[in-house]
Amino acid sequence: GELETSDVVTVVLGQDAKLPCFYRGDSGEQVGQVAWARVDAGEGAQELALLHSKYGLHVSPAYEGRVEQPPPPRNPLDGSVLLRNAVQADEGEYECRVSTFPAGSFQARLRLRVLVVLDPQEDSGKQVDLVSASVVVVGVIAALLFCLLVVVVVLMSRYHRRKAQQMTQKYEEELTLTRENSIRRLHSHHTDPRSQPEESVGLRAEGHPDSLKDNSSCSVMSEEPEGRSYSTLTTVREIETQTELLSPGSGRAEEEEDQDEGIKQAMNHFVQENGTLRAKPTGNGIYINGRGHLV
């Protein structure tokens, strides 16, 4: 004779599992009893149930109320059992041992797999839940739209910040240059540019206000290095230095003349308008703040 079973039985969590075990005997063989046991590796066999041809089904205390025989009509050679309300802990190896007369004992093993699904359907564990699927799709689309919105907002804010900065630069550039040149003209007799403290013209390293630390999960937003343009135009400090180099003489009168000459040269970069000095228009302006610091 031979014992027929399944290699793997798959059931959804909370549903009932049929553990098949059918003995196809040779002529005149009778099945005396079928014993079911849990036989996970590393652990001793744990009895589930005993199906006796004469005395019926006996279920072990650990599985009381959870193991049944399939409903009749039932083939007397069928040793299958029904495990009710499968839980995760039921997953593992099971053995069916059939005792026959006169052929002796036969045994077979199967593996029970318990699937955990979010929305189990009794109709079919493999059926796709269309509602869940559509919810996921809508969620993904919403996330993408949100990412797109974030990108647009960030780009717009960057653009506006740059615009505002450019406006401020132009405005302060005009103010500073006008103010400093006016002061220099007024106090040219008392001011020696060489005595000006060095730190007043040092470049000030400030954090770029536009720098964006992107912690979002949107892959759409890739960070690009900010494109900064470095001016090649002669700065006010350089003009002053050039002015100093023109006249190495020590006389006070010479100095005054040199100062005037320097101022004249500096004035080439400005236009007089309504009583104030304005920087000549250039495509590459430089922002010098009120303290004369270059940014």
């Epitope: 027929e4 049929k18 059918f22 005997g25 409903p71 009749p72 009509p73 083939n75 007397p76 050679l77």
Partner: antibody, heavy 118, light 107 residues
Framework: QVQLKQSGPGLVQPSQSLSITCTVS????????VNWVRQPPGKGLEWLGV???????DYNAAFISRLSISKDISKSQVFFKMNSLQADDTAKYYC????????????WGQGTSVTVSS | DIQMTQSPASLSVSVGETVTITCRAS??????LAWYQQKQGKSPQLLVY???NLADGVPSRFSGSGSGTQYSLKINSLQSEDFGTYWC?????????FGGGTKLEIK
């Protein structure tokens, strides 16, 4: 090879009994059970009952009171008997062997056409 | 009684096409299901047992699937000899009932 051959009357009087014999070859009745199924003309199939390899029987609950199935292992024969036939029992009656998983019917007889009429 | 609802009731298809016949049980039958083919004036023939297992001698273009209450029989690349009526049957509780049948006709 496996074969199931049926023999029985084609016409039965109302309220009378129907007896059909299914003679098998190519397998032993001690190893396999035999089912009985009927099919009214132009209609579907209806399971009536089974006699298992060990000799025990199971019947369709709707026919339990007027149906009996038995067998003679030495002659390799299965006997079907239904009492109190009416016009709506007119059908083709089949015997079929249970196979594989102990349930599905893998070999069928040629069928016996039975008409219940006076 | 467990009711077996088979669909469609009839199907008109051409040779070479693929068809799927479904059978729905009124309650869980734990894959205790068989599919049969019956030709006009002949006895039924077993195609599939245990919902998914192909019977001996049945061409591989036939396949059974399903679990719980929903089962189906698929026939790939229909041949002329595949036309006839198909039946599903459950073996879970008394009585074992058949579906209403699906008549497969040549288009």
């Amino acid at each position: 090879q496996v074969q199931l051959k049926q023999s029985g009357p084609g016409l039965v009087q109302p309220s009378q009994s129907l007896s059909i014999t299914c003679t098998v070859s190519g397998f032993s009745l001690t190893n396999y059970g035999v089912n009985w199924v009927r099919q009214p003309p132009g209609k579907g199939l209806e399971w009536l009952g089974v006699i298992w390899s060990g000799g025990s029987t199971d019947y369709n609950a709707a026919f339990i009171s007027r149906l009996s199935i038995s067998k003679d292992i030495s002659k390799s024969q299965v006997f079907f008997k239904m009492n109190s036939l009416q016009a709506d029992d007119t059908a083709k009656y089949y015997c079929a062997r249970e196979g594989y998983d102990g349930y599905a019917m893998d070999y069928w007889g040629q069928g016996t056409s039975v008409t219940v009429s006076s | 009684d467990i009711q077996m609802t088979q669909s469609p009731a009839s199907l008109s298809v051409s040779v070479g096409e693929t068809v799927t016949i479904t059978c729905r049980a009124s309650e869980n039958i734990f894959s205790s299901l068989a599919w049969y083919q019956q030709k006009q004036g002949k006895s039924p023939q077993l195609l599939v047992y245990g919902a998914t297992n192909l019977a001996d001698g049945v061409p591989s273009r036939f396949s059974g699937s399903g679990s719980g209450t929903q089962y189906s029989l698929k026939i790939n690349s229909l041949q002329s000899e595949d036309f006839g009526t198909y039946w599903c049957q459950h073996f879970w509780g008394n009585p074992w009932t058949f579906g209403g049948g699906t008549k497969l006709e040549i288009k």
